[in-house]
């Protein structure tokens, strides 16, 4: 798989999108997860309806949603506030049985707010040594939710 | 109606390669990904591997893996199970199966078989 | 790979009989368990998904239950077309793994 890349704002939502097959993949809840090192394992960061039929539902775990358009075949993650410890690389992943199948590898890359001046020294980018090749990088234009479009907090 | 209808039998002699075929009707044929299970004279079932005709997607159990090859003919609803050298080992009934992903719970059962490609090796 | 266990090998039984059994896995499998019937000459066929979800066209007589480790198939009242072998297979991981059988025989 190669290596989308997705750039949001601290700060700001960023929206990441990963395609599929919805044939090919029907019937399967999602899950987006964070790579734990080049070779450690994926951390399960939320994951879609336990009900496939109502995968569409937007469930969130903290600051990260996840919402699947299982007949399009688009699964949607949205990490809210964006932070510099969101940086890093996930994955998208089609769930059977115990496994799981990668749909898409994303690396999340947090750039500085223009608007702020506060030190960006933080902010993470992959350094020279950590290689994607093929990368592929979708810029995602994000602002911050508005009070009214905050959305409920989890229940359970 | 669905039905899968595998090739006939074969008799073959060891060393020589062959080819069954398993032919999907009744549905799409590129949508659901089709195994191949071995079943040994008077044994039990043995999951082989699988493909998704849709992109040739194909995975194989570790026993298998490098003994057989597994593809598919989207244009003709059609998956393969093949072999470069036949063993006497191979002697067996093959099935081809759909399987179906249950939104129930996520997994995957198989819901449709075919009637089984007998391949018997012998010198 | 996941082991599948089948109890017992083979059972004699009467047509009207109750008659269970059991599935054991080498390790938890939730409920991604399924449960097949063959015929001599025949490809098997699906009767149990998920454990305890009765396949369509499926008579009611058979049930299925269990989850984790340990699996039963149940068929209520034995009728003369249920004598066959049954197996229980796991959809838990690749590769997929299936029980060594259970030989339902006429007493």
């Known amino acids: 798989h190669n290596t989308t890349v997705f750039q949001g704002v601290a700060g700001q939502s960023l929206q990441v999108s990963c395609p599929y097959d919805s044939m090919k993949h029907w019937g399967r809840r999602k899950a987006w997860c964070r790579q734990l090192g080049e070779k450690g394992p994926c951390q399960r960061v939320v994951s879609t309806h336990n009900l496939w039929l109502l995968s569409f539902l937007r469930r969130w775990n903290g600051s990260t949603a996840i919402t699947d358009d299982t007949l399009g075949g688009t699964l949607t993650i949205t990490l809210r506030n964006l932070q510099p410890h969101d940086a890093g690389l996930y994955q998208c992943q089609s769930l059977h049985g115990s496994e799981a199948d990668t749909l898409r590898k994303v690396l999340v890359e947090v750039l500085a707010d223009p608007l702020d001046h506060r030190d960006a020294g933080d902010l993470w980018f992959p350094g020279e040594s950590e290689s994607f090749e093929d990368a592929h990088v979708e810029h995602s234009i994000s602002r911050s939710l508005l009070e009214g479009e905050i959305p409920f907090p989890p229940t359970s | 109606e669905v039905q899968l209808v595998q090739s006939g039998a074969e008799v073959k002699k060891p060393g020589e390669s062959l080819k069954i075929s398993c032919k999907g009707s009744g549905y799409s044929f590129t949508s659901y990904w089709i195994a191949w299970v071995r079943q040994m004279p008077g044994k039990g079932l043995e999951w082989m591997g699988i493909i998704y005709p849709g992109d040739s997607d194909t995975r194989y159990s570790p026993s298998f893996q490098g003994q057989v090859t597994i593809s598919a003919d989207k244009s003709i609803s059609t998956a393969y199970l093949q072999w470069s050298s036949l063993k006497a080992s191979d002697t067996a009934m093959y099935f081809c199966?759909?399987?179906?992903?249950?939104?129930?719970?996520?997994?995957?059962?198989?819901?449709?078989w075919g009637q089984g490609t007998l391949v018997t090796v012998s010198s | 790979d996941i082991q599948m266990t089948q109890s017992p090998s083979s059972v004699s039984a009467s047509v009207g009989d109750r008659v269970t059994i059991t599935c054991r896995a080498s390790q938890g499998i939730s409920s991604w368990l399924a449960w097949y019937q063959q015929k001599p000459g025949k490809a098997p066929k699906l009767l149990i998904y998920?454990?305890?979800s009765l396949q369509n066209g499926v008579p009611s007589r058979f049930s299925g239950s269990g989850s984790g480790t340990d699996f039963t198939l149940t068929i209520s009242s034995l009728q003369p077309e249920d004598f066959a072998t049954y197996f229980c297979?796991?959809?838990?991981?690749?590769?997929?793994?299936f029980g060594q059988g259970t030989k339902l025989e006429i007493k």
């Open positions: 297979q796991q959809a838990d991981s690749e590769p997929r793994t």
């Open positions: 199966a759909r399987q179906r992903t249950f939104y129930y719970d996520s997994s995957d059962y198989f819901d449709y």
């Open positions: 998920a454990a305890s």
